[in-house]
């Protein structure tokens, strides 16, 4: 009876939610009723007992196979090498923060924060990004100067399209420069880092869109957008990379109550993109040039382009007035890298297929945590590695290229039975010498089985121990690439493996 009642409540609540959506009820009300529906469904699930339990990962999450991890580690390696090349230190912060730390920092995205069930008095939330925890870290430790990178998982209660590389639990790779420096030098370096990483990863042609929060705010002001609507109109403008101007305009006017003529004025600006010449053109704009904020932003962008030319990356950068990154904490330059799909028709512009890196300047965020409101200017970037993993994985699948999932350099094998002791001794010697080595966990494995494993695992070398070889004091070393087999004296084996795998001297 209880189960039937609960099923009826789930049915009722589902209908209730659908009704609210049809009535265009407020997002808050719909969210609450959806939360209730999920809670009722969860209780129904618990009620079903063990026999109906479906073994799967939670929505928006996934496991990584060894093959996927190998791809991921290569991507991370490229990113970390670049961050270190630019002199960054590394930090780590807790995966959950006090709820209060994250509250009010993300604007309309705040509803996507995961709150943890109360555990003894502290209200906690899973981190939504790495930037807010970084600002909290700076304020807490009274730091005014640091260049750091941080690679870690973040959590968002999104409805992700996992096929497009979007998840509820995903990695972010952040690089940030905190400190009071001359304008646009750190900002330019961040863009240089972004371009270096995206070029090194060889995932295709990309473009970095650049704008400035002050230009956006100035533009909204001169177009006649009320102050109270800046943030919400920003989030509409930010959709221009996905939907047409007409749809964005309809949202602004129909849903957000903007006057049509104000929306049209915004449309004149946000549909423009170009290079430094557009910056100069806008500095001459009769309306924008009267707005202090916009002029400051445009002046900084002009300087930024000078540095980008010196860094040799100006051809990768586009000043795009529709870029309006959704996070509340940006205060200055903002940027977003998109992967370009080549045009299908001649004469068409390349098409952006989703953000793969983004960032900007956030000079006020640290001050939100400092008791005296002391600000620490910050600028940074975040690499969208999940999207990149998806792209790299798809490319590898298409090419059917074999991906090695281990770094084993040599398999220790035996040609006859009763040689387990000799294999164990040899593999131990190799490990002690810093060689990556493996053996099969059988007392008397067949040589054919050992060689089959060696080939499938893509291990470069196999060291074969035989009774005759033991008497002669040699080991047979066979190469997977050349198929050649040579006898190597036992005492020269480590050196020979190192030479063949180009490995420098190292120990554990």
């Amino acid at each position: 009876a209880d189960r039937a009642a609960l099923e009826e409540l789930v049915r009722l609540q589902g209908a209730h939610v659908r009704g609210l959506k049809e009535q265009k009820a407020s997002a808050e009300q719909i969210e609450e009723e959806v939360t209730k529906l999920l809670k009722l469904k969860a209780q129904l699930g618990q009620d079903e007992g063990k026999q109906k339990f479906v073994l799967k990962t939670p929505k928006g999450t996934r496991d990584y196979s060894p093959r996927q991890m190998a791809v991921r580690e290569k991507v991370f390696d490229v990113i970390i090498r670049c961050f270190k090349r630019h002199g960054a230190e590394v930090i780590d912060t807790p995966v959950f923060e006090l709820k209060e730390t994250l509250t009010g920092k993300y604007g309309e995205d705040s509803k996507l924060i995961y709150d943890l069930k109360d555990q003894g008095g502290e209200l906690l939330s899973l981190r939504y990004d790495l930037t807010v925890p970084f600002a909290r870290y700076l304020a807490m430790n009274k730091l005014t100067n640091i260049k750091r990178y941080h690679i870690a998982k973040v959590y968002r209660r999104d409805n992700p399209a996992m096929t497009r590389g979007r998840y509820r639990e995903f990695y972010q790779c952040d690089f940030d420069i905190a400190g009071q420096f001359d304008p646009m030098i750190p900002d330019a370096e961040c863009l240089k880092i972004m371009c270096e990483i995206l070029s090194s990863l060889q995932i295709g042609n990309f473009l970095v869109k650049v704008n400035d929060r002050r230009i956006l705010d100035g533009m909204f002001a001169v177009c006649g957008v009320p102050d109270s609507k800046f943030r919400t109109i920003c989030s509409s403008v930010d959709k221009l990379d996905k939907v047409s101007w007409e749809e964005v305009k309809n949202e602004m006017v129909g849903e957000k109550g903007l006057a049509p003529e104000v929306a049209d004025r915004i449309g004149d600006y946000v549909q423009q993109h170009g290079g430094v010449s557009l910056v100069e053109q806008l500095l001459q704009d009769p309306k924008l040039s009267q707005n202090k904020q916009a002029v400051e932003g445009l002046g900084d962008l002009k300087l930024l382009f000078e540095y980008l030319i010196l860094f040799g990356i100006d051809d990768k950068i586009s000043f795009d007035l529709s870029l309006a990154r959704g996070l509340d904490y940006y205060t200055g330059v903002i940027y977003e890298a998109v992967l370009l799909q080549m045009p299908t028709q001649a004469g068409e512009e390349p098409l952006g297929v989703g953000s793969i890196a983004a960032g900007g300047r956030y000079d006020g965020l640290v001050g939100m945590f400092d008791p005296k409101g002391r600000k620490v200017p910050c600028v940074g970037l975040s690499i969208g590695v999940e999207r990149i993993f998806s792209i790299v994985e798809q490319r590898l699948e298409a090419s059917e290229e074999k991906v090695r999932t281990t770094e084993t350099q040599v398999l220790v094998a035996s040609a006859q039975k009763k040689l387990l002791e000799e294999r164990l001794k040899l593999v131990s010697e190799l490990w002690d010498a810093g060689i990556k080595a493996e053996l099969l966990y059988k007392k008397n494995p067949k040589l054919l089985n050992q060689l089959q494993y060696w080939e499938e695992a893509g291990i470069p070398l196999v060291a074969i121990i035989g009774e005759q070889e033991l008497r002669d004091g040699v080991i047979k070393l066979r190469s997977v690439a050349s198929r050649e087999e040579v006898d190597v004296r036992r005492e020269d084996l480590v050196e020979e493996i190192r030479r063949r795998t180009n490995q420098p001297l190292s120990t554990c």
């Epitope: 209730h16 808050e28 709150d115």
Partner: antibody, heavy 120, light 107 residues
Amino acid sequence: QVQLVESGGGLVKPGGSLRLSCAASGFTFSDYYMTWIRQAPGKGLEWVSYISGSFRYTNYADSVKGRFTISRDNAKNSLYLQMNSLRDEDTAVYFCARYVYQVVAIGDLWGQGTLVTVSS
Amino acid sequence: DIQMTQSPSSVSASVGDRVTITCRASQGISSWLAWYQQKPGRAPKLLIFAASSLQSGVPSRFSGSGSGTHFTLTISSLQPEDFATYYCQQAESFPYTFGQGTKLEIK
């Protein structure tokens, strides 16, 4: 055992304040939406306010909006109602109740009630 | 706000009688309806939720039916402990509202 116990009622002058508490035991308090419902002497029941288990959602009857504040402390298994600018018509027995199936706005467990009298 | 109207406002009956109380909603509330029993000086006790689901521990002589705007609570065979005031409540939308109550008295 599973129960709710209200406290904090009493006599207060119009314009005064009072804070009601409700102590929960015997169930996982943080899983449940909780509510305050009142009943004026000899009259029917009126739903005053509710709060979700995670604090995310609260709501108030128009008659108390801006004057009453609902809150909870999941660590202490307690529900509260802060009542300010009290009026004669707020005189009632105040019950705290738990939502059925955690989230459905029907009280399946009620406290014994605490009497609030607003009078000069 | 959704208005809930109960009828009758009071009813006299004897032990063993079958009693029906009606509740009407001013607009459709699907099956978002509960019935409570309240005795003097006590808190209300939940009898029925989702219009017809019997709360655990409540005797099977109590039953509920209806959907949309018209609902009934039926006590199939009155017992001495059933004499009390009965309230309906809509749980479809806030503010959740109660009927004015039906007092069930001994004839």
